[in-house]
Interface confidence: low
Amino acid sequence: MGVQTHVLELTSSVSAEKIFQGFVIDVDTVLPKAAPGAYKSVEIKGDGGPGTLKIITLPDGGPITTMTLRIDGVNKEALTFDYSVIDGDILLGFIESIENHVVLVPTADGGSICKTTAIFHTKGDAVVPEENIKYANEQNTALFKALEAYLIAN
């Protein structure tokens, strides 16, 4: 099994606590308002804690239509969120899973940095192409910025 690691850092003028609340704790209610149409549907199995599954269907027309996320850990004190992508065509047929570690770091100006470390566990010696990483980063950035704009407005 291969392992690839990618880091995405996004800065925000919104505080780490507020981003964490919207991005992690209240994501299921905030995201549909912040980015309507980002998801076609979300089916939640579980209570929101570790082990909870989110079966996500994305809008038609994109390269990815399905993904299943498993919540691995939410630490409100440390502002960390761990989750894994464990199923769906997002895995491209050669990725076993994508382990994600998100941490919100407060900055001196009252804003925050959202640092996501994504660890791709691939089958055999398969390598995730750079264009796929770039696409994922663009989607995640767009989603984050939509969420940030919503939190600033509300």
Epitope: P50, G73, A78, V103, I119
Partner: antibody
Amino acid sequence: QVQLVQSGAEVKKPGASVKVSCKASGYTFAAHYMHWVRQAPGQGLEWMGWINTYTGGTNYGQKFQGRVTMTRDTSITTAYMELSRLRSDDTAVYYCARDRRNWNFVFEYWGQGTLVTVSS
Amino acid sequence: DIQMTQSPSSLSASVGDRVTISCRASQNIKNYLNWYQQKPGKAPKLLIYEASNLQSGAPSRFSGSGSGTDFTLTISSLEPEDFATYYCQQSFSIPWTFGQGTKVEIK
């Protein structure tokens, strides 16, 4: 102040297992990942894996997968590293090391080390 | 895996000397580079994290610079307690890997 206190030196035979403990104090145990790093005599440092002390989730270096098990007991703020099917080249000092903030994979605090000698 | 190569592997210097140690990564690791000091029989100690941030409690004579693939640890004026082995470590991509170490000895 932050302290990581490891269990004492061990001598093991090839094929046996060893379990090293790391008792943490002086901080919120579940707020920081714990890593294990080893150092063979006269050699450099080698990362073995981490445990998310909050969830118990682990990530092992590929070299050690199938032989290493990392666990924790939050009630006594202690992390454990067990290495099985020991070989002579596993002779090393084993360190636990705590992440600097949450988990940014910077090893801020280290245990004093546990020497594991594998010899027949 | 990302290979970390330090140079030199050892150096001799005198108290008061300015010392620089280099660390090169086999691929771009942005600023995810950390430096540790280790004395014989002791655990490593964090000196610099994420290329240029001085760890709390580390003396200000230590500084770090660089990004991408090339990094430097500088000791502005060597003190007797600085004779030790120094390791760089990348925290960009699993597995986290260390350089082979640079031993700073008394001339």
